[in-house]
């Protein structure tokens, strides 16, 4: 049988220079910081290989006593990075990832940065600011997103296979036109998921099938012309 696999795949985009932040502009910093909510938690999806900046509650640094970043990553002991204003000293406990650092000197900027986000940075990050008026927290459930690699090929007559490989979270695959489909998911130890959808089209007037992959990092469509039915020579449409 001729190879009509038309193997198409996305190239992984390079997001190394891209960066994302949920930080407020300095002008938006709440002067009357006592009105700031004592605890704010945010779910934050971040693309792998981007840079991420995580922020403390918007409290003027002059009112600070201690800033602590608490970082809880899967399968690792809790890491803390602390800065004490009075003595101008910083202290780290159980912190081994050199890509997670203060944005600059903590006496000037309390934000935390992750350079080139990796899957291992999935976890919970919390800034605790100790002030004379009490403690203020801001937490982030950081969800690292991994763009799946998408391939589409035929493995036998009028059957096509669409794969979204090593995505995080799992991608969703749909087809135009709809076929007789079976979908499987394969979970990897690093938290990524491969989704494989195999479809068959019995209807002979289906010429080309399109696999549409939906993912939080963006959508991708690939299409392929189906091989003829074996033995079919001529038909009028």
């Amino acid at each position: 049988q001729p190879n009509n696999s038309l193997m198409l795949q996305t190239s992984k985009e390079n997001h190394a220079l891209a960066s994302s932040s949920l930080c407020m502009d300095e002008k938006q910093i709440t002067q009357n910081y006592s009105k700031v909510l004592a605890e704010v938690n945010t779910s934050w999806p971040v693309k792998m290989a981007t840079n991420a900046v995580l922020c403390c509650p918007p409290i003027a640094l002059r009112n600070l006593i201690i800033i602590t970043w608490e970082i809880i990553l899967r399968g690792q002991p809790s890491c803390t990075k602390a800065y004490k204003k009075e003595t101008n000293e910083t202290k780290e406990t159980n912190c081994t990832d050199e890509r997670i650092t203060w944005v600059s000197r903590p006496d000037q900027n309390s934000d935390l940065q992750i350079r080139t986000v990796a899957i291992t940075h999935d976890g919970y990050y919390r800034c605790i600011m100790v002030t004379p008026d009490g403690n203020f927290h801001r937490g982030y459930h950081l969800q690292v997103l991994v763009t799946p690699e998408v391939t589409l090929f035929q493995n036998r007559n009028r059957t096509a296979v669409c794969k979204a490989v090593a995505g995080k979270p799992a991608a969703h695959i749909s087809w135009i036109p709809e076929g007789d489909c079976a979908t499987k998911q394969e979970y990897w130890s690093n938290g990524t998921v491969t989704v494989k959808s195999t479809c068959h089209w019995e209807v002979h007037n289906v010429s080309t099938v399109t696999c549409h992959v939906s993912h939080l990092t963006g959508n991708k469509s690939l299409y392929i012309e189906l091989l003829p039915v074996p033995g079919a020579k001529k038909s009028a449409k």
Partner: antibody, heavy 114, light 107 residues
Framework: QVQLVQSGAEVKKPGASVKLSCKAS????????MHWVKQAPGQGLEWIGN????????NYDEKFQGRATLTVDTSTRTAYMELSSLRSEDTAVYYC???????WGRGTLVTVSS | DIQMTQSPSSLSVSVGDRVTITCQAS??????LHWFQQKPGKAPKLLIS???NLEDGVPSRFSGSGSGTDFTFTISSLQPEDIATYYC?????????FGQGTKLEIK
């Protein structure tokens, strides 16, 4: 890069037949459907049919069934379309296309005139 | 057969205009399509493949969107060299079917 080179212009009498060729390069000829499209002067585009060189399987639009014949010669990587019982309304440019319609030949003008 | 209803059939335009052309598939049947540009005496040139993918070398002022049965082709800022006829082509079902074309004319 896929290239489709089509044969030259033809002038035919009504009732005659014409056979157009389309020579492919730059891709696996036997692995992709070859399609043929008609465009009459000042008109839109009409799909005639397609052929799968790997097996010889063919589909025709009903309008062209019986008068259009699609064939291939895999040894020369060439697709052919023969149109019989020509009439004036067959005067048109005929295009071959492949790779799911993403690669087109430049077209062959067929003029049917008495 | 799937009919492709393309509109408008003609459009009077000026340089710099935003141009929008639509194609709709009949029978409520989801399809995939290409968008082509054709100039007099030339073969159609593929601009947008698979509804929204800009072909290599095609200026970014051209774009395609939509899915299912309703599709849109846009020229964000018309240039003089864009004066041509534009066609959609559904390639999901046999027979493949084209829209009737949209001819752009300078005002």
């Amino acid at each position: 890069q896929v290239q489709l080179v089509q044969s030259g212009a033809e002038v035919k009498k009504p009732g005659a037949s014409v056979k157009l060729s389309c020579k492919a390069s730059g891709h696996t000829f036997t692995s992709y459907w070859m399609h043929w499209v008609k465009q009459a002067p000042g008109q839109g585009l009409e799909w005639i049919g397609n052929i799968y060189p790997g097996s010889g399987s063919i589909n025709y639009d009903e309008k062209f069934q019986g008068r259009a014949t699609l064939t291939v010669d895999t040894s020369t990587r060439t697709a052919y379309m023969e149109l019989s019982s020509l009439r004036s309304e067959d005067t048109a440019v005929y295009y071959c296309l492949t790779m799911t319609g993403t690669s087109w030949g430049r077209g062959t003008l067929v003029t049917v005139s008495s | 057969d799937i009919q492709m209803t393309q509109s408008p059939s003609s459009l009077s335009v000026s340089v710099g205009d935003r141009v929008t052309i639509t194609c709709q598939a009949s029978q409520g049947t989801p399809i995939n399509l290409h968008w082509f540009q054709q100039k007099p005496g030339k073969a159609p040139k593929l601009l947008i493949s698979g509804a929204s993918n800009l072909e290599d070398g095609v200026p970014s002022r051209f774009s395609g969107s939509g899915s299912g049965t309703d599709f849109t082709f846009t020229i964000s800022s018309l240039q003089p060299e864009d004066i041509a006829t534009y066609y959609c082509l559904q390639f999901t079902y046999i027979p493949w079917t084209f829209g009737q074309g949209t001819k752009l004319e300078i005002k």
